[in-house]
Interface confidence: medium
């Protein structure tokens, strides 16, 4: 999906208002500075591409993030403020219908959410610069 035509200001507002709280709650007892940020992004569409990938694409050591509250809110925000986004996600959603039991938060998942926090902060900084 091409995030170029999203309403970035609205996405920022949703993040500041609610998604950030869910990310921080998930990270309770740790913080983004506890992990090295290895993922970065250069502009707003690129940041959203990376955020989508880290939030919704399962990795071998962290498969369950898409079911977390912050992920559900991220999905709703992107569907609301990125034209045509929800249509591109229908196939991906159906592939996830086989629900797994929620796993205990692993260190790898914490690391991944830490990367997400870094990407969101980068997204906001690029927004402040009005690139």
């Amino acid at each position: 999906y091409d995030f170029t035509n999203c309403d970035f200001e609205k996405i920022e507002a949703d993040y500041l208002r609610t998604i950030s709280k869910d990310l921080i709650t998930y990270m309770s007892g740790t913080k983004s500075t506890d992990f090295n940020n290895t993922v970065s992004c250069s502009n707003r569409p690129h940041c959203l591409t990376e955020i989508q990938s880290l939030t919704f694409n399962p990795t071998p050591r962290c498969a369950s993030l898409a079911k977390e509250m912050f992920a559900r809110k991220t999905k709703a925000t992107l569907a609301l403020w990125c034209p045509g986004y929800s249509e591109t996600q229908i196939n991906a959603t159906q592939a996830m219908k086989k629900r797994r039991k929620r796993k205990v938060t692993t260190n790898k998942c914490l690391e991944q959410v830490s990367q997400l926090l870094g990407l969101w902060r980068r997204f906001i900084r690029t927004l402040l610069k009005k690139q």
Epitope: A13, R17, T18
Partner: antibody, heavy 120, light 108 residues
């Protein structure tokens, strides 16, 4: 421009009740977690409690000294936050601020405050 | 319950750098915010998320946070910076905790 305006403060006797209001404008009130914070004369800031947005279930949390005596509610149709204070004690005397929460649990907008004096 | 400790007062010469500390057990694992409050006025957020500045806050204000201490740094202090400063952090038991406040005096 974000604006928060508190009202309803005044003098009340110990054991009495008071209801504070906070009128919000300049933002989509229903989307935000809203708080009450108080400051006793010459003292520091003390968090009283908050109410989450409806999308976050609209639940409330309270600081230990006011739990069971104070109730926070909101009317999103009127863009108004409320603090119902019952069984008031002299130590509840303070300026009461309403505040909007944003980003990592910080308060980015505050009202001007309303003074509540509990005295016999 | 979680506690945040601040010095009661800090003095700084006009144009010099002021540092206000906020101590708490493993505070580095929490996000810390700083508020400025002038007499008779409501608090104003000057730093959030350890080191981020809201729009309208001068670059002279900065923050850091690691270990057991968070620090608010005000460089090139001005007379208008004289105020009470409060740190705040979210603790998962006490929800929202404020430090006791620090009175900043700008000398000269």
């Amino acid at each position: 421009e974000v604006q928060l305006v508190e009202s309803g403060g005044g003098l009340v006797k110990p054991g009495g009740s008071l209801r504070l209001s906070c009128a919000a404008s300049g933002f989509t009130f229903s989307d935000y977690w809203m708080h009450w914070v108080r400051q006793a004369p010459g003292k520091g800031l003390e968090w009283v409690g908050h109410i989450k947005s409806k999308t976050d279930a609209g639940t409330t949390d309270y600081a230990a000294p006011v739990k069971g005596r104070f109730t926070i509610s909101r009317d999103d149709s009127k863009n108004t936050l409320y603090l119902q204070m019952n069984s008031l004690k002299t130590e509840d005397t303070a300026v009461y601020y309403c505040a909007r929460e944003i980003y990592y649990y910080a308060f980015d907008s505050w009202g001007q405050g309303t003074l509540v004096t509990v005295s016999s | 319950s979680y506690e945040l400790t601040q010095p009661l007062s800090v003095s700084v010469a006009l144009g010099q750098t002021a540092r206000i500390t906020c101590s708490g057990d493993n505070i580095g694992s929490k996000y810390v915010h700083w508020y400025q409050q002038k007499p008779g006025q409501a608090p104003v957020l000057v730093i959030y998320g350890d080191n981020e500045r809201p729009s309208g806050i001068p670059e002279r204000f900065s923050g850091s946070n690691s270990g057991n201490t968070a620090t608010l740094t005000i460089s090139r202090a001005q007379a208008g910076d004289e105020a009470d400063y409060y740190c705040q952090a979210a603790d998962w038991v006490d929800f929202y905790v404020f430090g006791g406040g620090t009175k900043l005096t700008v000398l000269g």
